[in-house]
Interface confidence: low
């Protein structure tokens, strides 16, 4: 006959308050003859949880029919779990004896602990925007979980990040815990469309981690590059000057033209386009009247982007005598 083994497969069982906990116990042999009892704790002070033969255990039910002779499953369910139920539970085989049964073998025990799922992670970015090549911090918080063991990972566009610090509080025993992690992310110029993800894995989530996300578009400012060019063609007495504002984010932009230091209100036309990486281009056209101008006209395109200090680009207008004398037809 095979030697009796008491199998309690779960080392740890997580339960929530008010729910029912199932404590598994199976045996590998029907011998020796005698009952299986459940205890919490060990030693002389252990607490009897279930005895099929005697006693009243209103919160305990058996999973199988223990009255059947060939039953080898002594698993029990304990209903309406409270914090007072935590501890290590042992199923113990007794051998028929006289005048009383004798303890024969104990299972390895199942620790029952209160479990609670973490809240959905909340990711917060920096309060102010930062330009590429700089480092920004993101924080991730999740609360209310138990037990304390938890895994948190950071990703940027699917790539795992390594520069982060994580704390789980409190450090001592508690009914529930919180996690806070701060990740440092170096911004790239193309990060307008990027995301950071905080992923939390916990035993209560059954292998399906929780995720919180933040868009780097909220944290990045890509400053524009400016280029002012004079078009080779003119219309009558006017020369077309273009100011190209490239690769900026966010969209907030003020553009001002000035002529020899005097701000001009007239802007012929402008277009806004979005690049594949999420940044924007802005093109502004300005017509300069050259019929009675001297040769030393200086045009300035000034751009104020997202409340930052203005940047500008100047162009000294090239108006040849030949251009001044031409007719009002458009010419190359």
């Amino acid at each position: 006959e095979e030697e009796l083994q008491m199998i309690q497969p779960e080392k740890l069982l997580l339960v929530t308050v008010g729910k029912t906990a199932t404590l598994h116990c199976t045996v590998t042999s029907l011998l020796p003859v005698g009952p299986v009892l459940w205890f919490r704790g060990v030693g002389p002070g252990r607490e009897l949880i279930y005895n099929q033969k005697e006693g009243h255990f209103p919160r305990v039910t058996t999973v199988s029919d223990l009255t059947k002779r060939n039953n080898m499953d002594f698993s029990i369910r304990i209903s309406s779990i409270t914090p007072a139920d935590v501890g290590t539970y042992y199923c113990v085989k007794f051998r028929k004896g006289s005048p009383e049964d004798v303890e024969f073998k104990s299972g390895p025990g199942t620790e029952m602990a209160l479990g609670a799922k973490p809240s959905a992670p909340v990711v917060l970015g920096p309060a102010a925007r930062t330009t590429p090549e700089h480092t920004v911090s993101f924080t991730c918080e999740s609360h209310g979980f138990s037990p304390r063991d938890i895994t948190l990972k950071w990703f940027k566009n699917g790539n795992e990040l390594s520069d982060f610090q994580t704390n789980v509080d409190p450090t001592g025993q508690s009914v529930a815990y919180s996690i806070r992690s701060t990740a440092r992310v170096v911004l790239d110029p193309w990060d307008v469309r990027s995301q950071v993800i905080c992923e939390v894995a916990h035993v209560t989530l059954q292998g399906d981690p929780l995720r919180g996300t933040a868009n780097l578009s909220e944290a990045i400012r890509v400053p524009p590059t400016l280029e002012v060019t004079q078009q080779p063609m003119r219309v009558g007495n006017q020369v077309n000057v273009t100011c190209q504002v490239r690769k900026f984010y966010p969209q907030s932009l003020q553009l001002t033209w000035s002529e020899n230091g005097n701000v001009c209100q007239r802007e012929t036309a402008s277009t806004l386009t979005e690049n594949k990486d999420g940044t924007y281009n802005w093109t502004s056209w300005f017509l300069v009247n050259i019929s009675d101008q001297r040769d030393d006209v200086v045009l300035t395109c000034q751009v104020k982007h997202d409340g930052q200090l203005a940047v500008s680009k100047r162009l000294a207008l090239e108006v040849t005598v030949h251009q001044k004398d031409q007719s009002s037809d458009a010419t190359p």
């Epitope: 497969p9 729910k19 598994h24 999973v63 059954q206």
Partner: antibody, heavy 118, light 107 residues
């Protein structure tokens, strides 16, 4: 991706036998109770069997003694051996995972059709 | 065995409606009640477990409530994809048992 894929269904004569398989992927198979549920065409769902992580097994009276459930954790596989089949066993058979939090059936396979007919 | 009785058996509603399906157990099931959605030719999909907990990935328009023996599934604002058959199931006691189903149809 968490996935369950059933196979082994087909046409069998009354009194015959059939063995259904369920291949699990994307999770730690050995940590979960597993279940079989069936659905006769145009009718409702009926629980057929459960196997616990300790190997404990459960059946309703309608199949007890005729069906056996087993698992092979090393192969991430669940099985349902159906003997002495009757016309009333004709149904789509689904395997389902019992969530280790509270044994709710959280993930289901696509099902495999079993037809018992002469 | 625990009997699970769903009502109504069928229900006609319009897009945007709020609908409620009820499920009654023949004895106390300790809130171990699940709700499933099934579309023709497809496997059931888990919506709710332990009477009121939303399964991961299920939209919040689905909600479950109740305790003891009486439970409800509510869909707050029906969308075309919500027209399906809904089942309740108790998993407190073997044998696990399902309700007979509620077919939700477009009015």
């Amino acid at each position: 991706e968490v996935q369950l894929v059933e196979s082994g269904g087909g046409l069998v004569q009354p009194g015959g036998s059939l063995r259904l398989s369920c291949a699990a992927s994307g999770f730690t198979f050995s940590s979960f109770d597993m279940h079989w549920v069936r659905q006769p065409t145009g009718k409702g769902l009926e629980w057929v069997s459960t196997i616990g992580i300790a190997g404990d097994t459960y059946f309703p009276g309608s199949v007890k003694g005729r069906f056996t459930i087993s698992r092979e954790n090393a192969k991430n596989s669940l099985y349902l051996q159906m003997n002495s089949l009757r016309a009333g066993d004709t149904a789509v058979y689904y395997c389902a995972r019992g969530g280790n939090w509270d044994d709710a059936l959280d993930i289901w396979g696509q099902g495999t059709m079993v037809t018992v007919s002469s | 065995d625990i009997q699970m009785t769903q009502s109504p058996s069928s229900l006609s509603a319009s897009v945007g409606d709020r609908v409620t399906i009820t499920c009654r157990a023949s004895q106390d099931i300790n809130n171990y009640l699940a709700w499933f959605q099934q579309k023709p030719g497809k496997a059931p999909k888990s919506l709710i477990y332990t009477a009121s907990s939303l399964q991961s990935g299920v939209p919040s328009k689905f909600s479950g409530s109740g305790s003891g023996t009486d439970f409800t599934l509510t869909i707050s604002s029906l969308q075309p994809e919500d027209f399906a058959t809904y089942y309740c199931q108790q998993y407190n006691t073997y044998p696990y048992t399902f309700g007979q189903g509620t077919k939700l149809e477009i009015k």
